[in-house]
Amino acid sequence: APVPPGEDSKDVAAPHRQPLTSSERIDKQIRYILDGISALRKETCNKSNMCESSKEALAENNLNLPKMAEKDGCFQSGFNEETCLVKIITGLLEFEVYLEYLQNRFESSEEQARAVQMSTKVLIQFLQKKAKNLDAITTPDPTTNASLLTKLQAQNQWLQDMTTHLILRSFKEFLQSSLRALRQM
């Protein structure tokens, strides 16, 4: 499911519960995705020794995974709500191609991988409603994404395992950074 249980407007199980605010919904959505990543990481770590690998830096050079930096205004020092929100949305849009890559990378957690991907799309929609300056958000070029996906899928098995591990680790870190920032807004 792309939305955490109890978040759907059709859910009438708790009639006395106050409807979630926009911020609460975003918070819950991110934590839901993070739980999904946690499950995917478990499968990845059980399947290979990538989680302890010290060679990650080599593979990381080939990936242009979004990362928070001081200039993005998402940290406690130099916090800037507008700049940060743009960075979060832009970063999530950039992660989408990597989440697409993950779709055929799991055996027992195939549904979980799909849920992470779909939930991220929903999260982007939530955040876009919150953002005032949508013009500042750059959407990745579909052609570039398609060729990147082809390139990633053509890697040997070891590199594919490493890429999977790095995507999950980076996405987790990006979402954690985003969650900390959004809790300041």
């Epitope: 928070m68 406690q76 680790r169 969650l179 900390r180």
Partner: antibody, heavy 116, light 110 residues
Framework: SVEESGGRLVTPGTPLTLTCTVS????????MSWVRQAPGKGLEWIGY?????STYYANWAKGRFTISKTSTTVDLKMTSLTTEDTATYFC???????????????WGPGTLVTVS | AYDMTQTPASVEVAMGGTVTIKCQAS??????LSWYQQKPGQPPKLLIY???TLASGVSSRFKGSGSGTEYTLTISGVECADAATYYC????????????FGGGTKVVVV
């Protein structure tokens, strides 16, 4: 394992840097925290350094305390020390089992800082 | 600011008895709450995280519950070894915080 060092007797106004040395822990994968405890008092959180290298501090610690890290150490730099800063300083490792929840599952024995 | 208020500050409990410690957050912390046990001269030890999940090797006599702003640690069948100070800690927010820890509860076993 986690171990703190650098605690000693200093005079007020002296700067001091404490070092937390880790072994068997990849600091790029774990959040770390500094916590202190004055004699006979409760735990007082100083700050976190997260895997993204961002630092977050308690309101009272901002500007006077700085946390930084290398691949095997986490430093706590303290300036303008007063007698109120006399405490045992602990370094603790955050856990990443759960996707988001800053809990501290491994603590060092602590290092004593006396300002007198 | 996110503040954690822990009660009582101190409690006496008979061997085999039950003790309840409460922790109140000034704002909702979405179940991101941990409990620690600290004995004199030792660093704290993680007991429970995410409100109710027992940390590795911790006795099932320790039980955590709660939601929103109200959380509870219950120790049943109290043993001598449970004599310690217990702290709650919110893991929800690290910005605009004076202390992520509650003030502590000293448990005395009689």
């Amino acid at each position: 394992s986690v171990e703190e060092s650098g605690g000693r007797l200093v005079t007020p106004g002296t700067p001091l840097t404490l070092t937390c040395t880790v072994s068997g822990i990849d600091l790029s994968s774990y959040d770390m925290s500094w916590v202190r405890q004055a004699p006979g008092k409760g735990l007082e959180w100083i700050g976190y350094i997260y895997t993204d290298s961002s630092t977050y501090y308690a309101n009272w610690a901002k500007g006077r305390f700085t946390i930084s890290k290398t691949s095997t150490t986490v430093d706590l730099k303290m300036t303008s020390l007063t007698t109120e800063d006399t405490a045992t300083y602990f370094c603790a490792k955050g856990s990443t089992d759960y996707a988001f929840d800053t809990r501290l599952d491994l603590w060092g024995p602590g290092t004593l800082v006396t300002v007198s | 600011a996110y503040d954690m208020t822990q009660t009582p500050a101190s409690v006496e409990v008979a061997m085999g008895g039950t003790v309840t410690i409460k922790c109140q957050a000034s704002q909702s912390i979405s179940n991101e709450l941990s409990w620690y046990q600290q004995k004199p001269g030792q660093p704290p030890k993680l007991l429970i995280y995410r409100t109710s999940t027992l940390a590795s090797g911790v006795s099932s006599r320790f039980k955590g519950s709660g939601s929103g702003t109200e959380y509870t640690l219950t120790i049943s069948g109290v043993e001598c070894a449970d004599a310690a100070t217990y702290y709650c800690q919110q893991g929800y927010n690290s910005n605009d915080v004076d202390n992520v820890f509650g003030g502590g509860t000293k448990v005395v076993v009689v």
